[in-house]
Interface confidence: medium
């Protein structure tokens, strides 16, 4: 998994809350653009694990060819394996589809480590455990790749759910979700519940286990507890948000909030870790080390290069701190915080030496392209990508891993001033973090 950082694409926290509570404007949830309540047909439609990605079953072509597709909110192409590959059990066979249309155009996507390239076309696509619709969508048929597919991951393609601005080869290639919304009555919203197991899963357990839910077109109340809190989408390219404060066990990191978003902060289901800008990472690790100083761990552990192990069932969760990220709220000068536990940021490693031990990787790592709220964060929460209202909602996930003493939390509101200053303005170039 390229050191468990980016799956599969990219390798590999000013304003202070005053502790003053603002009254909620109303106890009612605001009207949603999508239907609410129960989406039984879509619940539990994801499988996988944070280290290798979460995937949904999709069908492509006529007659339908079934493929498992990685759900990735950090990219915008729908791309599927379309040629034999040692790590693929199956692949898209365009010649067998009567509805395939060739766009006579290639696409090449390089990453820091590896790449994929393919041929663009369109075909009929549906999601068996999704809305009961079929759409004609752009498909990149991957004909060649290097370090893209993951041995044993059980997915054969990637569903980029971000915006057209970061689509390859350019923003004229309409992403799948845009096509879905344009061609059907599905509301412009989806929500994700990624369920980390909290323990390592072997291959057969992954295939048999539930990995979570992707609710297309709405919000399912059964998947979260408490209230949903929304943060604005700053710009529609990645799902970019603004972090205004970071705390480790309630202790403010006390950094200029611009540092937390340098050069951006995004919500990305295709990244394993919580990735932090260099300065923020160093400050966070220093603080986490201090909080967990009753046990000393080697530098290799904090760098994500070394596992730390305890005999089964003896992991001392209590010595590790909680981490809180404060996000810009929807109301002026109002923020809310999301809090994750060590059960989220210590990732159980499935390929360990022995079942007699519980071994973990530190799943917070350094980034040169801003903060990435990957699976480590998302596994604590039900995350609503409300594209219609240009906002992202967070609520405590009904499936998050916790212990009897602490739970993940979404809390607010907090007064935070000058939050707009926390955003970093990237110089306008043809910049893309697909290369990082």
């Amino acid at each position: 998994t390229q050191h468990g950082i980016r799956l599969p694409l990219r390798s590999g926290l000013g304003g202070a809350p005053l502790g003053l509570r603002l009254p909620r404007e109303t106890d009612e949830e605001p009207e949603e653009p999508g239907r609410r309540g129960s989406f039984v047909e879509m619940v539990d439609n994801l499988r996988g694990k944070s280290g290798q990605g979460y995937y949904v079953e999709m069908t492509v072509g006529s007659p339908p060819q079934t493929l498992n597709i990685l759900v990735d909110t950090g990219s915008s192409n729908f791309a599927v394996g379309a040629a034999p590959h040692p790590f693929l059990h199956r692949y898209y066979q365009r010649q067998l589809s009567s509805t395939y249309r060739d766009l006579r155009k290639g696409v090449y996507v390089p990453y820091t480590q590896g790449k994929w390239e393919g041929e663009l076309g369109t075909d009929l696509v549906s999601i068996p455990h999704g809305p009961n619709v079929t759409v004609r969508a752009n498909i990149a048929a991957i004909t060649e790749s290097d370090k893209f597919f993951i041995n044993g991951s059980n997915w054969e393609g990637i569903l980029g759910l971000a915006y057209a601005e970061i689509a390859r080869p350019d923003d004229s290639l309409e992403p799948f979700f845009d096509s879905l919304v344009k061609q059907t009555h599905v509301p412009n919203l989806f929500s994700l519940q990624l369920c980390g197991a909290g323990f390592p899963l072997n291959q057969s357990e992954v295939l048999a286990s539930v990995g979570g839910s992707m609710i297309i077109g709405g919000i399912d109340h059964s998947l979260y507890t408490g209230s949903l809190w929304y943060t604005p989408i700053r710009r529609e390219w990645y799902y970019e948000v603004i972090i205004v404060r970071v705390e480790i066990n309630g202790q403010d990191l006390k950094m200029d909030c611009k540092e937390y978003n340098y050069d951006k902060s995004i919500v990305d289901s295709g990244t394993t870790n919580l990735r932090l800008p260099k300065k923020v990472f160093e400050a966070a690790v220093k603080s986490i080390k201090a909080a967990s100083s009753t046990e000393k761990f080697p530098d290799g552990f904090w760098l994500g290069e070394q596992l730390v192990c305890w005999q089964a069932g003896t992991t001392p969760w209590n010595i590790f701190p909680v981490i809180s990220l404060y996000l810009m709220g929807e109301v002026t000068n109002q923020s809310f915080r999301i809090t994750i536990l060590p059960q989220q940021y210590l990732r159980p490693v499935e390929d360990v030496a022995t079942s007699q031990d519980d071994c973990y990787k530190f799943a917070i790592s350094q980034s040169s392209t801003g903060t990435v709220m990957g699976a480590v964060i998302m596994e604590g929460f039900y995350v609503v990508f409300d594209r219609a209202r240009k906002r992202i909602g967070f609520a405590v996930s009904a499936c998050h891993v916790h212990d009897e003493f602490r739970t993940a939390a979404v809390e607010g509101p907090f007064v935070t001033l000058d939050m707009e200053d926390c955003g970093y303005n990237i110089p306008q170039t043809d910049e893309s973090t697909l290369m990082t």
Epitope: Q306, T354, D357
Partner: antibody
Framework: EVQLVESGGGLVQPGGSLRLSCAAS????????IHWVRQAPGKGLEWVAS????????SYADSVKGRFTISADTSKNTAYLQMNSLRAEDTAVYYC???????????????????WGQGTLVTVSS | DIQMTQSPSSLSASVGDRVTITCRAS??????VAWYQQKPGKAPKLLIS???WLYSGVPSRFSGSGSGTDFTLTISSLQPEDFATYYC?????????FGQGTKVEIK
Amino acid sequence: EVQLVESGGGLVQPGGSLRLSCAASGFNFYYSSIHWVRQAPGKGLEWVASISPYSGYTSYADSVKGRFTISADTSKNTAYLQMNSLRAEDTAVYYCARQPTHYYYYAKGYKAMDYWGQGTLVTVSS
Amino acid sequence: DIQMTQSPSSLSASVGDRVTITCRASQSVSSAVAWYQQKPGKAPKLLISWASWLYSGVPSRFSGSGSGTDFTLTISSLQPEDFATYYCQQYSYSPFTFGQGTKVEIK
């Protein structure tokens, strides 16, 4: 389930050669050390050699240095012990065992050889 | 090479007895000492790692202690299934070396 399965033992004449295999499954072979330990009939345990696949580092007991070579094929999750110039005193049951390397940091120290194969008998006799 | 001298080489004991086996290293090996149990025709099984760390699944009647050069394996109340040969091993320095073994027999 963690498993180590030795094979390749048998009867060989003094001065002859034999290659033992240790097929590993159920754990991260690359980040473990694989050891060969032997036990002559009615005697105690004698450590023979070890390899760490991730680094390629090898180590040998003085009694086999220059005659035995340990290697590993990470694509097959298999370790080998190539035994040349065999002597009567090399007759023993040969076990392979695994030990977590420093990649696995244990809060309470380093683990020893926690999994062993069933052993394969090597008899050196004319 | 580091020598591991184990004593006694054999002992006879009854079910319920407290049994102590000692192992002395020729130089300090920190805490990197393991204890193994072996029954006839079987591979050794790890009991204790890092001098005193009871391996998962091993009954709590087994315990280990010591550091530096002197180490002890104790069986607090001997059970019928404990009759076997016990080996200490240092894994601080290569070549890793074993003690000569202690055979625990039924009195």
